[in-house]
C-alpha cells in the first residue's frame, strides 16, 4: 500500500498545529518533565515490517485523537487550533485505514503487529496516567504536547523511509 504524499503533508500540518498550540514556555515546566518511553523499537528502521509500521502509525494517531478529544483537553487548548488538529488527524486515519485494510489477513505478520499495537497502547497509557496524576495541569499538558510532537516527528521521518523503500 502506498501512503499518499498528502499523508506526509498532513503529518507536517499536524506538527505545525501542535507547535502553535503551545501556550506556556517549555522552560517553565522543566520540573514536570517525564520519560514516557516512546516505543522506538516498534518503528525501528532496521527490522520493522511495513504492515507493522502502518498498524502502529494508525494506533498512534487514533490514541492521539482520543487523548486530545477529552473535555480536559478542550479546556487546555485553543478551540480553533484543536479543531484544525482533529481534521488533520482524521484525514491521516482515513489514509492509514485504507492501508491497514489492505494488510488485514496477512497471517505471518499478525504476531508482530500485536506487539507493536500493544507497545503504542501502553505508551499512551503512560501519558494518560501522567496527565491524571498531574490533575491535567497546564504544565502537564505542555509536557504531553511536546512529547506528541516528538513522536509525530519520528513517525514523519519513518514514513519518508517507507515511501523510499517502495
Amino acid at each position: 500500500c502506498d501512503l499518499p504524499q498528502t499523508h506526509s503533508l498532513g503529518n507536517r500540518r499536524a506538527l505545525i498545529l501542535l507547535a502553535q498550540m503551545g501556550r506556556i514556555s517549555h522552560f517553565s515546566c522543566l520540573k514536570d518533565r517525564y520519560d514516557f518511553g516512546f516505543p522506538q523499537e516498534v518503528f525501528d528502521g532496521n527490522q520493522f515490517q511495513k504492515a507493522q509500521a502502518i498498524s502502529a502509525f494508525h494506533e498512534m494517531i487514533q490514541q492521539t485523537f482520543n487523548l486530545f478529544s477529552t473535555k480536559d483537553s478542550s479546556a487546555a487548548w485553543d478551540e480553533t487550533l484543536l479543531d484544525k488538529f482533529y481534521i488533520e488527524l482524521f484525514q491521516q486515519l482515513n489514509d492509514l485505514e485504507a492501508c491497514v485494510t489492505q494488510e488485514v489477513g496477512v497471517e505471518e505478520i499478525a504476531l508482530m503487529n500485536e506487539d507493536s499495537i500493544l507497545a503504542v497502547r501502553k505508551y499512551f497509557q503512560r501519558i494518560t496516567l501522567y496527565l491524571m496524576g498531574k490533575k491535567y495541569s497546564p504544565c502537564a499538558w505542555e509536557v504531553v504536547r511536546a512529547e506528541i510532537m516528538r513522536s509525530f516527528s519520528f513517525s514523519t521521518n519513518l514514513q519518508k523511509g517507507l515511501r523510499r523503500k517502495d
Epitope: H58, Q62, E97, E114, L118, K122, Q125, R126
Partner: antibody, heavy 119, light 108 residues
Framework: QVQLVQSGAEVKKPGASVKVSCKAS????????MHWVRQAPGQGLEWMGE????????IYAQKFQGRVTMTRDTSTSTVYMELSSLRSEDTAVYYC????????????WGQGTLVTVSS | EIVLTQSPATLSLSPGERATLSCSAG???????LYWYQQKPGQAPRLLIY???NLASGIPARFSGSGSGTDFTLTISSLEPEDFAVYYC?????????FGQGTKLEIK
C-alpha cells in the same frame, strides 16, 4: 452516555456456529477497540480477542484462533463475534467490552449474551 | 500467557470486617496494566480499580489496591452488604489478556 447492547440468547447444536452482535452508542464507534470476553457457568472471565472498528483489524487469543471471527459494520456501529464448530464447553455468557485507556479500559460492558450448546 | 492466581477462592466475612484479596501473577506485570473488577450474579463485571491503585469513577473510598511485580492486593477496609460479590484481577500487560479465576466474597 456510552451503551453497548447485545443480541439475545441463543441455543445451538454441537458443530454449529453462532454470531453475537454488540451495538455501540454514545461515543465515536471507530475510535475504540472492542473486546469480547466470555464466562462459562460458574466460571471466571476469559478474554477472546478484540477488533478495531476503524479498519477491522483483529487480534485473537491463540485458544480461539481459527474458530472465532470478529467483524464490524460501521454504518450501524455494531461489532459481531462469530464462533464456529461449537462444543458443549462453549456454553457461556459472551460479553463485549470497550477498550480505552486509564479508567476507560473495560469500563463499559454489554449486558451479555447467553449461548447454550446442547444436542 | 500470564497466569493470574487469586486467593483465597472464597472469603467468608461479616459486614464491617476488613477484606484482603490477593492476585499473584505467573510473571511480572507492570502495575499500570493491572485492574480489578467486581461482578454480581446476573450482571456484567464492573471496573473497580485501574492501574493497581486508582479508584474508578463512583467507587467508594473503602476500596483500595496495591502491589507490584507479581503480587497485587485488593483491600476493602470495612465491608458493606453490597460488597459481597466475586472479584477478578485482570492484566493487559501482554497478550493474551488474562483474568484471575476470581475470589468469591460471601457473608459469614
Amino acid at each position: 452516555q456510552v451503551q453497548l447492547v447485545q443480541s439475545g440468547a441463543e441455543v445451538k447444536k454441537p458443530g454449529a456456529s453462532v454470531k453475537v452482535s454488540c451495538k455501540a452508542s454514545g461515543y465515536t464507534f471507530t475510535n475504540y477497540w472492542m473486546h469480547w470476553v466470555r464466562q462459562a457457568p460458574g466460571q471466571g472471565l476469559e478474554w477472546m480477542g478484540e477488533i478495531n472498528p476503524s479498519h477491522g483489524r483483529t487480534i485473537y487469543a491463540q485458544k480461539f484462533q481459527g474458530r472465532v471471527t470478529m467483524t464490524r459494520d460501521t454504518s450501524t456501529s455494531t461489532v459481531y463475534m462469530e464462533l464456529s464448530s461449537l462444543r458443549s464447553e462453549d456454553t457461556a455468557v459472551y460479553y463485549c467490552a470497550r477498550g480505552g485507556l486509564g479508567p476507560a479500559w473495560f469500563a463499559y460492558w454489554g449486558q451479555g449474551t447467553l449461548v447454550t450448546v446442547s444436542s | 500467557e500470564i497466569v493470574l492466581t487469586q486467593s483465597p477462592a472464597t472469603l467468608s466475612l461479616s459486614p464491617g470486617e476488613r477484606a484482603t484479596l490477593s492476585c499473584s501473577a505467573g510473571s511480572s506485570v507492570d502495575s499500570s496494566y493491572l485492574y480489578w473488577y467486581q461482578q454480581k450474579p446476573g450482571q456484567a463485571p464492573r471496573l473497580l480499580i485501574y492501574s493497581t491503585s486508582n479508584l474508578a469513577s463512583g467507587i467508594p473510598a473503602r476500596f483500595s489496591g496495591s502491589g507490584s511485580g507479581t503480587d497485587f492486593t485488593l483491600t476493602i477496609s470495612s465491608l458493606e452488604p453490597e460488597d459481597f460479590a466475586v472479584y477478578y484481577c485482570h492484566q493487559w500487560s501482554s497478550y493474551p489478556f488474562t483474568f484471575g479465576q476470581g475470589t468469591k466474597l460471601e457473608i459469614k
